[in-house]
């Protein structure tokens, strides 16, 4: 009975996500057969989050809306380890929007999920950000510095990275 009710709960939770994510990839968390963590297929997983590289080129606002429709946000990068994981899936000749913007042009950078902006955990390329007109952040590759962030005009279409919390069932 216990296993049956657990299965019913899992199925009901899976139905919630089915509209946007018809297929999930789940792994057992730890040693307890009861706990599974899932990411939509073909999203990648790192720690407690799932990531999707969107190769369609859109403005920052449209990229954020696109992530939102999938139950995610443009990526918020909290640690160097997280960035190191993300860049494994990026192409060096492309740029990708982050969930970081300065809509007022006052250098008050803000993350889409309201995570406080911490100057000590940022990975700007040297000399960036450098233009008050450029109010959205991308991650891109520069041969001299490898991967880092740059400020650009928000309406210029770029690829993007979506991030959502893992689905626990």
């Amino acid at each position: 009975n216990f296993m049956y009710s657990k299965t019913v709960k899992r199925l009901s939770k899976l139905r919630e996500y089915q509209q946007y994510h018809p297929s999930l990839t789940c792994v057992m968390e730890g040693k307890d057969i009861e706990d599974w963590s899932c990411c939509p297929t073909p999203w990648t997983s790192f720690q407690s989050s799932c990531y999707f590289i969107s190769t369609g080129m859109q403005s920052w606002t449209k990229s954020q809306k696109n992530c939102s429709v999938m139950g995610a946000d443009l990526v918020v990068i909290n640690t160097r380890e997280e960035q190191d994981f993300i860049i494994q899936n990026l192409k060096r000749n492309s740029s990708y929007f982050l969930g970081l913007s300065d809509p007022g042009g006052r250098r008050h950078w803000q993350w889409v999920d309201q995570t406080p902006y911490n100057e000590n955990v940022t990975f700007w390329h040297s000399g960036e950000p450098n233009n008050l007109d450029e109010r959205c952040a991308i991650i891109n590759f520069r041969s001299s510095e490898e991967w880092g962030w740059n400020d650009i005009h928000c309406h210029v279409p770029q690829k993007s990275i979506c991030k959502m919390k893992k689905i626990y069932i």
């Epitope: 809509p103 007022g104 233009n131 008050l132 007109d133 928000c154």
Partner: antibody
Framework: EVQLLESGGGLVQPGGSLRLSCAAS????????MSWVRQAPGKGLEWVAT????????YYPDSVKGRFTISRDNSKNTLYLQMNSLRAEDTAVYYC??????????????WGQGTTVTVSS | DIVMTQSPDSLAVSLGERATINCKAS??????????VNWYQQKPGQPPKLLIY???NLESGIPDRFSGSGSGTDFTLTISSLQAEDVAVYYC?????????FGGGTKVEIK
């Protein structure tokens, strides 16, 4: 008072080249993103190119990408548009304009009087 | 690309009467409470002039008989009491995503 003065227009044969200039005064040119917009005879407006204040980022629509190059010389307060491989459909009045950000978008708030480019054999 | 469709193509209005111009975007140009649509006025032989930005914000120095409204995909420019100097072509433009695109223009004349 903001002033933008375009020059360099004229008659050119198809396949030819032309360089337009836009001399700016009355504002701190080096801190402004700038754009070119064109208007074919009796037609509407078409965005042609944008360059950021430092000149390191440039943007174009597909219709001119690979043929037109926007650049600037902040020491001379001048914006340029190098136009190569010109076609009859590039015939238009070309305006330079200042760009002002508005949250995630922008406006083109000051425009020059324009310079006329005619591509014809 | 986002297509901006203006209507009508031309409009004849009596002096002192209201003129209304519509602009429809092929997809939403809103984000976080702001609409990325601007309106420009172009008089014969002159460059365009910014009237309204962000769908409803009146540019400095523009008479308050001009107003803008709308959100999502549908936007309107209204001249509450047409003056002789308002004879011009009016263009809407979206700045949400490159390439920036303009409507085809609406010619306003005196009836």
């Amino acid at each position: 008072e903001v002033q933008l003065l375009e020059s360099g227009g004229g008659l050119v044969q198809p396949g030819g080249s032309l360089r337009l200039s836009c001399a700016a005064s009355g504002f701190t040119f080096s801190t402004y993103t700038m754009s070119w917009v064109r208007q074919a005879p009796g037609k509407g407006l078409e965005w042609v190119a944008t360059i950021n204040s430092g000149g390191d980022n440039t943007y174009y629509p597909d219709s001119v990408k690979g043929r037109f190059t926007i650049s600037r010389d902040n020491s001379k307060n001048t914006l340029y548009l190098q136009m190569n491989s010109l076609r009859a459909e590039d015939t238009a009045v070309y305006y330079c304009a200042t760009y002002r950000p508005y949250y995630y978008g922008s406006v083109l708030d000051y425009w020059g009087q324009g310079t006329t480019v005619t591509v014809s054999s | 690309d986002i297509v901006m469709t203006q209507s009508p193509d031309s409009l004849a209005v009596s002096l002192g009467e209201r003129a209304t111009i519509n602009c429809k975007a092929s997809q939403s140009v809103d984000y976080d409470g702001n609409s990325y649509v601007n309106w420009y006025q172009q008089k014969p032989g002159q460059p365009p002039k910014l009237l309204i930005y962000g769908a409803s914000n009146l540019e400095s120095g523009i008479p308050d008989r001009f107003s803008g409204s709308g959100s999502g995909t549908d936007f309107t420019l209204t001249i509450s009491s047409l003056q002789a100097e308002d004879v011009a072509v009016y263009y809407c433009q979206q700045s949400d995503e490159d390439p920036w695109t303009f409507g085809g223009g609406t010619k306003v004349e005196i009836k």
